[in-house]
């Protein structure tokens, strides 16, 4: 997150981190039920760990943290790497969470976001496009949903109904490492960090997010059948 601020501890209890090896964060994720996460489909890896209830970027133990393995990764069938359409994936964890003030699921919005809606995006991604700048703790950033027209003007030929744009204030944006993390609007999960221009946080090049209202049925059906 570029030019965000430290999230309040436990204010984003649905925020997850996907880790490679002992502690290499490569994507965010969102807890949507006691045993299921959502993340971006482009975050799919054969082996990874899941960390919930953690505030710091560092591997230091925190009392609220819970660690999991992914036992099933189900990318949307319409996703094709390295494209950006249908960029979501369900992850079933090896066990259910212990519900606590640090770890709680978020409800998915059934209605699509409208232009001007204020939302919160969060993550431990880079704080500039100079790739080694990471925050000490989870970052939060208020962003505004942009019109479809403005979104398409920003990225001609690249935007479809499975995406929405948000942000666009120069110097504020999601960035590398935030993928799969939550965009929460009015208390409900509206999107996932997906893509945007490189470097992040450029004028008229907003962040692009997976438009989850288009996938509510697929998410429910997939969870029920697995």
């Amino acid at each position: 997150i570029v030019n965000g601020s430290d999230c309040q501890k436990d204010a984003q209890p649905w925020q997850g981190a996907l880790l490679l090896g002992p502690n290499k964060l490569y994507c965010g994720a969102v807890l949507i039920s006691p045993q299921w996460l959502l993340t971006a489909a482009h975050c799919r890896k054969p082996v990874f760990r899941i960390r919930l209830g953690h505030h710091s970027m560092s591997p230091v133990y925190e009392s609220g943290q819970q660690m999991f393995q992914g036992i099933k990764s189900i990318p949307h069938p319409g996703y094709s790497h390295p494209g950006h359409s249908n960029d979501l994936m369900l992850i079933k964890m090896n066990r259910k969470i212990r519900d606590s003030h640090s770890v709680k699921p978020v409800e998915i919005a059934c209605d699509c976001a409208t232009e001007g809606t204020r939302c919160m995006v969060s993550g431990w991604g880079t704080t500039s496009s100079s790739h080694n700048n990471f925050p000490k703790v989870l970052q939060c950033l208020n962003i505004t949903v942009l019109s479809e027209e403005r979104c398409k003007n920003s990225y001609p030929g690249q935007i479809d109904k499975t995406m929405f744009c948000a942000g666009d204030e120069e110097g504020r944006d999601s960035c590398q490492g935030d993928s799969g993390g939550p965009v929460v609007c009015n208390g409900k999960l509206q999107g996932l960090v997906s893509w945007g221009d490189f470097p992040c946080a450029q004028r008229n090049r907003p962040g692009v997010y997976t438009n989850l209202c288009e996938f509510v049925k697929w998410i429910k059906d997939t969870m029920n059948s697995n």
């Epitope: 490679l20 090896g21 290499k24 964060l25 490569y26 994507c27 971006a40 482009h42 975050c43 890896k45 390295p82 494209g83 950006h84 991604g125 880079t126 100079s130 790739h131 080694n132 990225y155 690249q158 999601s174 960035c175 590398q176 490492g177 935030d178 993928s179 799969g180 960090v193 997906s194 893509w195 945007g196 221009d197 490189f198 470097p199 992040c200 090049r205 962040g207």
Partner: antibody
Framework: EVQLVESGGGLVQPGGSLRLSCAAS????????MNWVRQAPGKGLEWVSY????????DYADSVKGRFTISRDNAKNSLYLQMNSLRAEDTAVYYC???????????????????WGQGTTVTVSS | DIQMTQSPSSVSASVGDRVTITCRAS??????LAWYQQKPGKAPKLLIY???SLQSGVPSRFSGSGSGTDFTLTISSLQPEDFATYYC?????????FGGGTKVEIK
């Protein structure tokens, strides 16, 4: 079959210009970032330039900055390298290479170059 | 710029030998290192990405390890087709930089 084919190399005098082309086939070209990499005779690999899938981000090695220009035409599935003010030290085999990393995607994960052309030879000599 | 230093510059080995090549970055690059194989007159071929992930179609005798600044490519049992030059490359930070190469020759 996924393929990259370079063309446009040849013999040129110092100070001259050349335009290299790279024709891509067998994959969705506009989804991928691309690179030019060169190799001087008997030497190692040297990265020359990078262009993102939408051309919004471009970068160059210091050795070619201000002289070389990378570009792409996604409608034609083609990558280009315009080389001006050529010097003897630019003599090399030039490869185009597909980058597996999408700089647009906001994961923190980097791959490498998974598809390479056969190379085209540029000789700068008087 | 990040400098990549490979060692040794050449190694003589026999079929069946275990060969280890090292690559050192001048600053930490996490796990974002790729290894390539190049045979004379041919284009490089991606063997390993993210320091230890085997590219599709690459034999399992090739393996990579390391993180931060020190990385290793290992060929567990050298085969005749493995005699080539190997290069490391750091990929997270522009300008991308390659190591100087390690030539694996027949003893």
């Amino acid at each position: 079959e996924v393929q990259l084919v370079e063309s446009g190399g040849g013999l040129v005098q110092p100070g001259g210009s050349l335009r290299l082309s790279c024709a891509a086939s067998g994959f969705t070209f506009n989804d991928y970032s691309m690179n030019w990499v060169r190799q001087a005779p008997g030497k190692g690999l040297e990265w020359v330039s990078y262009i993102s899938s939408s051309s919004s981000y471009i970068d160059y090695a210091d050795s070619v900055k201000g002289r070389f220009t990378i570009s792409r035409d996604n409608a034609k599935n083609s990558l280009y390298l315009q080389m001006n003010s050529l010097r003897a030290e630019d003599t090399a085999v030039y490869y185009c290479a597909r980058d597996l990393t999408s700089m647009q995607s906001r994961d923190y994960y980097y791959y490498g170059m998974d598809v390479w052309g056969q190379g085209t030879t540029v000789t700068v000599s008087s | 710029d990040i400098q990549m230093t490979q060692s040794p510059s050449s190694v003589s080995a026999s079929v069946g030998d275990r060969v280890t090549i090292t690559c050192r970055a001048s600053q930490g690059i996490s796990s974002w290192l790729a290894w390539y194989q190049q045979k004379p007159g041919k284009a490089p071929k991606l063997l390993i990405y993210a320091a230890s992930s085997l590219q599709s179609g690459v034999p399992s005798r090739f393996s990579g390890s390391g993180s931060g600044t020190d990385f290793t490519l290992t060929i567990s049992s050298l085969q005749p087709e493995d005699f080539a030059t190997y290069y490391c490359q750091q990929v997270p930070i522009f300008p991308y930089t390659f190591g100087g190469g390690t030539k694996v020759e027949i003893k």
